[in-house]
Interface confidence: medium
């Protein structure tokens, strides 16, 4: 079945912004390529693991590639897959787990000496159908074994801010963590109203730089809705 | 702070086409998510569409999706709305905003921080 081959992508109580403004149900809303958000209050849950859709890898988390649920199925209908781990079939790098990649349809690990900070190896096999043409690792890859080698610049895979460059933190943008800059005075920023609640984001913030605290700003031109802008604020 | 100045609105027969535009001053445009909104007479402003930094990504809600085109030059600091197929439920005044940064959450109204006055688009059927 369907749900067999579904991963963690879907995630429990999902925040307003993905239904559209808060308070404001109206219509569903896609983002291309062939993602939708629902509206209203009807978010996916972890319970019903619903599909998270794609058109490529880099649109899925770190540990997950894109393709069709089913053997040999529609192209067209591609969702976020668990990666593949050590010793298991792949076709491409992307399907492998981070630290591993794909040689001769097998995931192997990718050792230390492999990786020399930049990718120096062009592979072009190819496997049946399935984004067939191994051109090259895949970004999502070469920037995860980068890390080991190099701080992680604006829009590097990550797992926690330490990858990152000075001035950047590890944030979930859709399914992946990339480093991003640390927010400066103005910026938009979020308030949690409870604790554990950062880690359901899709589009989650950096905090807010030295000498700064995300607060209420009063001035802001829906009055009515002030409370729920947030921004950075000298202290 | 960045200016936004919408234009490009008018009257139009259903079935037709309009090309809005939103030109920033102030600030490039090319660092942030930009999105157009929509508020039709008594009704909420409601989300019409967004296109983040690079142009990459798009969002549409389903109201539009087909009919409606967003792009952005950040080399003139424009973001463009093609609307095509216009439908007397398209009649609006539509506003042009522009959020803080690349990362905001681009179907979020409260993340925009600037926004433009506004063009008025008139749909008769």
């Known amino acids: 079945t369907l749900n067999s081959v579904l991963n963690s992508n879907a995630i429990k109580n999902l925040p307003p912004p993905l239904g559209g403004a808060a308070g404001h149900p109206g219509s569903a809303v896609s983002a291309a390529p062939g993602i939708l958000y629902p509206g209203g209050n009807k978010y996916q849950t972890i319970d019903n693991y619903q599909p998270y859709p794609c058109a490529e890898d880099e649109e899925c988390g770190t540990d997950e590639y894109c393709a069709s649920p089913t053997r040999g199925g529609d192209a067209g209908v591609q969702i976020c897959l668990a990666c593949r781990k050590r010793r298991k079939r792949c076709m491409r790098h992307a399907m492998c787990c981070p630290g591993n990649y794909c040689k001769n349809g097998i995931c192997v690990s990718s050792d230390q000496n492999h990786f020399r900070g930049e990718i120096e190896e062009t592979i072009t096999e190819s496997f049946g159908n399935d984004h067939s043409t191994l051109d090259g690792y895949s970004r999502r890859t070469t920037l995860s074994s980068k890390m080991y080698h190099t701080k992680g610049q604006e829009g590097s895979v990550c797992l926690r801010s330490s990858d990152c460059a000075s001035g950047l933190c590890c944030a979930r943008h859709f399914w992946s963590k990339i480093c991003k800059p640390v927010l400066k005075e103005g910026q938009v920023c979020t308030k949690h109203r409870r604790k554990g609640s950062h880690g359901l984001e899709i589009f989650q913030r950096c905090y807010c730089g030295e000498g700064l605290s995300c607060r209420i700003q009063k001035d802001h031109h829906q009055a009515s809705n002030s409370s729920r802008l947030h921004t950075c604020q000298r202290h | 702070e960045v200016q936004l100045v919408e234009s490009g609105g008018g009257s139009v027969q259903a079935g037709g086409s309009l090309r809005l535009s939103c030109t920033a001053s102030g600030r490039a445009l090319s660092s942030a998510v930009v999105g157009w909104f929509r508020q039709a007479p008594g009704k909420e402003r409601e989300f019409v569409t967004a296109?983040?930094?690079?142009?990459?990504?798009?969002y549409y809600a389903d109201s539009v999706k087909g009919r409606f085109t967003i792009s952005r030059d950040n080399a003139k600091n424009t973001v463009y709305l093609q609307m095509d197929s216009l439908k007397s439920e398209d009649t609006a005044v539509y506003y042009c905003?522009?959020?803080?940064?690349?990362?905001?959450?681009?179907?979020?109204?409260?993340?925009?921080?600037?926004w433009g006055q506004g063009t008025q688009v008139t749909v008769s059927s």
């Open positions: 905003a522009s959020a803080s940064d690349r990362y905001a959450r681009p179907l979020d109204e409260y993340e925009y921080v600037s």
């Open positions: 296109i983040n930094w690079s142009g990459a990504r798009t």
